[in-house]
Interface confidence: low
Amino acid sequence: MEDEKPKVNPKLYMCVCEGLSCGNEDHCEGQQCFSSLSINDGFHVYQKGCFQVYEQGKMTCKTPPSPGQAVECCQGDWCNRNITAQLPTKGKSFPGTQNFHLE
């Protein structure tokens, strides 16, 4: 079944923004919020932000988590404030990885 198209003037949600794409802002406004975790050069890189356009997040949010990347999306003001994306391999740690928050 085709996804329902957003209305002409979709509601923008306020999202926590953490990461390089946020510049100097600690929040952003978009149609969806996200929290992501990826492994980059052996580091766990956590990022949070928003998708301004519905289509922008549509594919990303539907992508199932892989051992190297996970994204969780939500709709609601500040809905990603307490969401921390988890990699699918529960109980196992990747060798040589460290936690690293891009803020």
Epitope: Y13, M14, G23, E25, H27, E29, D77, W78, R81
Partner: antibody
């Protein structure tokens, strides 16, 4: 070191105009949203308005009591924030602070400039 | 429009814990920040995003936000902590930028 220095305050009659300036240094001014906050003598803090960075649309927002009378602008080439105040009322008497606006908090504040509206 | 209510004054003995509350509808939906202001000085950010402390702010300052109340806690209060404290919340998508009325913290003795 981040520094915000307000100027332009003074005594003005009701109905008059005044323009406040806020000179910023120690950070990339053009990248940041900026706000004005005021404090009437012996009273609490009151948010006046803000201007986003040009990269973030450069739009302005205002508190209801000043909307239509006050205008916030910025000159990124001079690292300066402005507050143009028209149709001033006695209740606008306050110390006016400029602040670096991080969206959910005001990270840095200037020392303030006093505006007195009195006949 | 949201209204934030703070107690006008709070008194505490040196070394004790001071709690300053800020209550209002939907506060948990927003991030609260807290500002310290001493007489004749500009406000200083002491807590942002409910519970985060900027660098340079002593560890005795902490914050929380649950129910309909945001709380600033000062553990082991010192004489230099005597000041006015203001909470603040923002929700630009609802045109909300609001400070609480302020709380005067008095350190006894």
């Amino acid at each position: 070191e981040v520094q915000l220095v307000e100027s332009g305050g003074g005594l003005v009659k009701p109905g008059g105009s005044l323009r406040l300036s806020c000179a910023a240094s120690g950070f990339t001014f053009s990248s940041h949203a900026m706000s004005w906050v005021r404090q009437a003598p012996g009273k609490g803090l009151e948010w006046v308005g803000r201007i986003k960075s040009k990269a973030d649309s450069g739009t302005t927002d205002y508190a209801a009591p000043v909307k239509g009378r006050f205008t916030i602008s910025r000159d990124d080439s001079k690292n300066t924030l402005y507050l143009q105040m028209n149709s001033l009322k006695t209740e606008d008497t306050a110390v006016y602070y400029c602040a670096r606006d991080y969206g959910v908090a005001f990270a840095y504040w200037g020392q303030g400039t006093l505006v007195t509206v009195s006949s | 429009d949201i209204e934030l209510t703070q107690p006008p004054s709070v008194s505490v003995s040196p070394g004790q814990t001071a709690s300053i509350t800020c209550s209002g509808d939907s506060i948990p939906s927003f991030f609260a920040s807290w500002y310290q202001q001493k007489p004749g000085q500009a406000p200083v950010l002491v807590i942002y995003r409910d519970s985060n402390r900027p660098s340079g702010i002593p560890e005795r300052f902490s914050g929380s936000n649950s129910g309909n109340t945001a709380t600033l806690t000062i553990s082991g209060t010192q004489a230099e902590d005597e000041a006015d404290y203001y909470c603040y919340v923002t929700a630009p998508w609802k045109s909300i930028w609001v400070f609480g009325g302020g709380t005067k913290l008095t350190v006894l003795g």
